[in-house]
């Protein structure tokens, strides 16, 4: 499956947190979403291959690595000034 | 900052095997990319050798494949290169080198190479 | 295999000339996911290859803006819009959508 964390977090200001995403599906391609209240899914960075990935809708605030197949963190930086959000990863084929 | 350093004989008798070691400082090679080895012969052009990934699977170039094992010391945070029944064709610069974050499988941390000589 | 060709294998130019090098692949280099796998690197004698242009047209960080990538399917190009002197040396493209990896013979570029 794929397995998201932490559930909740808060952030201090100035900080930079980062989200763990791993799955073990042998998926090559990893997603990260936002989800702000009444809206829908905005794409921030997604990754097709380990060690590449591609900024999405709205990547400014965000960064993003791609060690392994089977992980790829998002780290909310002390640039996002508006990170209060629901965050998703998804992966695929 | 990723660093790499290869190590092992520079003079290598024909038939025989060809080892090389790979030192990498500055980040561990269990947690992810690949690590590859590529060699150029004196005043040519380079040849990619193949790789070990972060979990140990290999990929190899075919023109090589029969002859060519790379494996790993974790403990020592080492990757190693052994070439089979070795010939004069084999003398080279071999580097070490890791991919740099972001771009793919193309590689941008190197050894500083070191020349082996296959010769009687 | 890839082959990758460049041309000219040799050129001769002069600090401040406009200089293209050309490398062309016998496959397509648009990987399965959409993505172009075509770098450059610089080499200069005794030293290891130093890497200037990732996937067709993204300077690598520290590369000067003289150096540009463009092209696409088979065909590719690096740019130096002005030799500076440290530009002599010799260029490699290389792929890394298939496997194996590979690279072109290298143009040397030398002063004139």
């Known amino acids: 499956g794929i397995t998201q964390s932490p559930k909740y977090l808060f952030r201090k200001e100035g900080q930079n947190v980062t989200l763990s995403c791993e799955q073990n599906l042998n998926h090559d391609a990893m997603y990260w979403y936002r989800q702000d209240p009444g809206q829908g899914l905005r794409l921030i960075y997604y990754s097709q291959i380990v060690n590449d990935f591609q900024k999405g809708d709205i990547a400014e605030g965000y960064s993003v690595s791609r060690e392994k197949k089977e992980s790829f963190p998002l780290t909310v930086t002390s640039a996002q000034k508006n990170p209060t959000a629901f965050y998703l990863c998804a992966s695929s084929i | 900052q990723v660093q790499l350093q290869e190590s092992g004989p520079g003079l290598v008798k024909p038939s025989e095997t060809l080892s090389l070691t790979c030192t990498v400082s500055?980040?561990?090679?269990?947690?992810?990319?690949?690590w590859n080895w590529i060699r150029q012969p004196p005043g040519k052009g380079l040849e990619w050798i193949g790789y070990?990934?972060?979990?140990?699977?290999?990929n190899y170039n075919p023109s090589l494949k029969s002859r060519v094992t790379i494996s790993r010391d974790t403990s020592k945070n080492q990757f190693s290169l052994k070439l089979s029944s070795v010939t004069a064709a084999d003398t080279a610069v071999y580097y070490c080198?890791?991919?740099?974050?972001?771009?793919?499988?193309?590689?941008?941390?190197w050894g500083q190479g070191t020349l082996v000589t296959v010769s009687s | 295999d890839i082959q990758m060709t460049q041309s000219p294998s040799s050129l001769s130019a002069s600090v401040g000339d406009r200089v293209t090098i050309t490398c062309r692949s016998s496959?397509?280099?648009?990987?399965?996911?959409?993505?172009?796998?075509l770098h450059w690197y610089q080499q200069k004698p005794g030293k290891a290859p130093k890497f200037l242009i990732y996937?067709?047209?993204n300077r690598f960080s520290g590369v000067p803006s003289r150096f540009s990538g463009s092209g696409s399917g088979t065909d590719f190009t690096l740019t130096i819009s002005s030799l500076q002197p440290e530009d002599f040396a010799t260029y490699y493209c290389?792929?890394?959508?298939?496997?194996?990896?590979?690279f072109g013979q290298g143009t040397k570029l030398e002063i004139k």
């Open positions: 070990i990934s972060y979990d140990g699977s290999n």
């Open positions: 500055g980040y561990s090679i269990t947690s992810g990319y690949f």
């Open positions: 080198a890791s991919p740099s974050p972001g771009t793919g499988y193309a590689v941008d941390y």
């Open positions: 496959q397509s280099l648009v990987h399965s996911n959409g993505n172009t796998y």
């Open positions: 290389s792929q890394s959508t298939h496997v194996p990896f590979t």
């Open positions: 996937k067709v047209s």
